[in-house]
């Protein structure tokens, strides 16, 4: 590597590579400064002058140290069935995720492209598998001895209460009715809810610690390559 005191632009020694936050400019054949996240290259470097960077305009961003001529456009505004979990800033793209009660039917690298409402299990059916951020609720018929009298994306089938004397037998959509004032024991003191699916508001307000992903662009090389070998083509 060249000595750390070398200032950009500088010609790298044969076989060496540009330093962190620098790139090799094929035209100038020099190691030049990259622009920091939130900026882009306004003027490319020459043999005598370094890269000139400028801030990204509104609704555009760069997430990486770069030398792109223009910042990337932020994704479109989140739809009504989505919440914005990461705002568009000069350094990161907007991320939209599904709002509570919805799941992602069509995902993209970061966030969701298409949300759909979580299925609600009708009376006589309970939740067999709860909805997640990326999968719908799966319903199942209530087995004998259990019931569900709600239309819900979270309620499971609950056991019928046990009666001393049964007034009305329970079925898949209704609990048993006892003649005595109170059953000998109740196995179903109240509605049983499954945990909320992963896509909940509390988790929207605490996004995971991964930053948004910039589109794959060949000119976003994190480190400058070595000067090209004889006969190879430039970027």
């Amino acid at each position: 590597l060249p000595a750390q005191v070398a200032f950009t632009p500088y010609a790298p020694e044969p076989g060496s590579t540009c330093r962190l936050r620098e790139y090799y400019d094929q035209t100038a054949q020099m190691c030049c400064s990259k622009c920091s996240p939130g900026q882009h290259a306004k003027v490319f470097c020459t043999k005598t002058s370094d890269t000139v960077c400028d801030s990204c305009e509104d609704s555009t961003y760069t997430q990486l140290w770069n030398w792109v001529p223009e910042c990337l456009s932020c994704g479109s505004r989140c739809s009504s069935d989505q919440v914005e979990t990461q705002a568009c800033t000069r350094e990161q793209n907007r991320i939209c995720t599904c709002r509570p009660g919805w799941y992602c039917a069509l995902s993209k690298q970061e966030g969701c492209r298409l949300c759909a409402p979580l299925r609600k299990c009708r009376p006589g059916f309970g939740v067999a598998r709860p909805g997640t951020e990326t999968s719908d609720v799966v319903c199942k018929p209530c087995a004998p001895g259990t019931f569900s009298n709600t239309t819900s994306s979270t309620d499971i089938c609950r056991p019928h209460q046990i009666c001393n004397v049964v007034a009305i037998p329970g079925n898949a959509s209704m609990d048993a009715v006892c003649t005595s004032t109170s059953p000998t024991r109740s196995m179903a003191p109240g509605a049983v809810h499954l945990p909320q699916p992963v896509s909940t508001r509390s988790q929207h307000t605490q996004p995971t610690p991964e930053p948004s992903t910039a589109p794959s662009t060949s000119f976003l090389l994190p480190m400058g390559p070595s000067p090209p070998a004889e006969g190879s083509t430039g970027d």
Epitope: L1, Q4, T17, C18, R19, L20, R21, K34, P37, Q63, L64, W65, N66, Q109, E110, P209, E210, P211, T213, A214, P215, S216, T217, S218, L220, L221, P222, M223, G224, P225, S226
Partner: antibody
Framework: QVQLLESGGGLVQPGGSLRLSCAAS????????MSWVRQAPGKGLEWVSI????????FYADSVKGRFTISRDNSKNTLYLQMNSLRAEDTAVYYC????????????WGQGTLVTVSS | DIQMTQSPSSLSASVGDRVTITCQAS??????LNWYQQKPGKAPKLLIY???TLQTGVPSRFSGSGSGTDFTFTISSLQPEDIATYYC?????????FGQGTKVEIK
């Protein structure tokens, strides 16, 4: 979400070779520089190597230079570390990590794979 | 190579205490300093980059400051889940180097 999954670790004799892999998902792999960091049992973190997003720039720690080779296959979303002439002091958990801003700040890590060099 | 010296190597504090860890670089690294948390048996987690920028999703009780050669990492109110080893790392130049780590325990 970002996921990195290392594999290929195991027991190898001194002087032997091993190739580690890191399968990436949940992000545009070809946009990010990737790195290997290791941790000897009961010790601190030691950076091993880094590779640019396109794979055409690589850097190594002096302790592994000439013995280890970092590479990547962007079509398979996979990072590799070829380790030759292994020594007892290479025994460690090896982590692959994503460089989040192309400035050597590692924002996502795999769970690690243990490499034991012993006779 | 740039050497990173962390202190103390370990500390014990009570829940709610303010905890401070320092990191010194052997040469000027501007603000290219990152802090990681590593819990036993787990991979490290980036908490702070560029000396003072909090990584997305990291609680605000964690903070960092400093530039040049002297840097500080602070937990404003220690929580039981903060039991871990903390590492500083310079990202100014290759080879990338880490501090030796600071183990934080609860009294």
């Amino acid at each position: 979400q970002v996921q990195l999954l290392e594999s290929g670790g195991g027991l190898v004799q001194p002087g032997g070779s091993l190739r580690l892999s890191c399968a990436a998902s949940g992000f545009t792999f070809s946009t990010y520089a990737m790195s290997w960091v290791r941790q000897a049992p009961g010790k601190g973190l030691e950076w091993v190597s880094i590779i640019s997003d396109g794979g055409d720039a690589t850097f190594y720690a002096d302790s592994v230079k000439g013995r280890f080779t970092i590479s990547r296959d962007n079509s398979k979303n996979t990072l590799y570390l070829q380790m030759n002439s292994l020594r007892a002091e290479d025994t460690a958990v090896y982590y692959c990590a994503r460089d989040g801003t192309s400035a050597a700040a590692f924002d996502s890590w795999g769970q690690g794979t243990l490499v034991t060099v012993s006779s | 190579d740039i050497q990173m010296t962390q202190s103390p190597s370990s500390l014990s504090a009570s829940v709610g205490d303010r905890v401070t860890i320092t990191c010194q670089a052997s040469q000027d690294i501007t603000n290219f300093l990152n802090w990681y948390q590593q819990k036993p048996g787990k991979a490290p987690k980036l908490l702070i980059y560029d000396a003072s920028t909090l990584q997305t999703g990291v609680p605000s009780r964690f903070s960092g400051s400093g530039s040049g050669t002297d840097f500080t990492f602070t937990i404003s109110s220690l929580q039981p889940e903060d039991i871990a080893t903390y590492y500083c790392q310079q990202s100014d130049s290759y080879p990338i180097t880490f501090g030796q780590g600071t183990k934080v325990e609860i009294k």
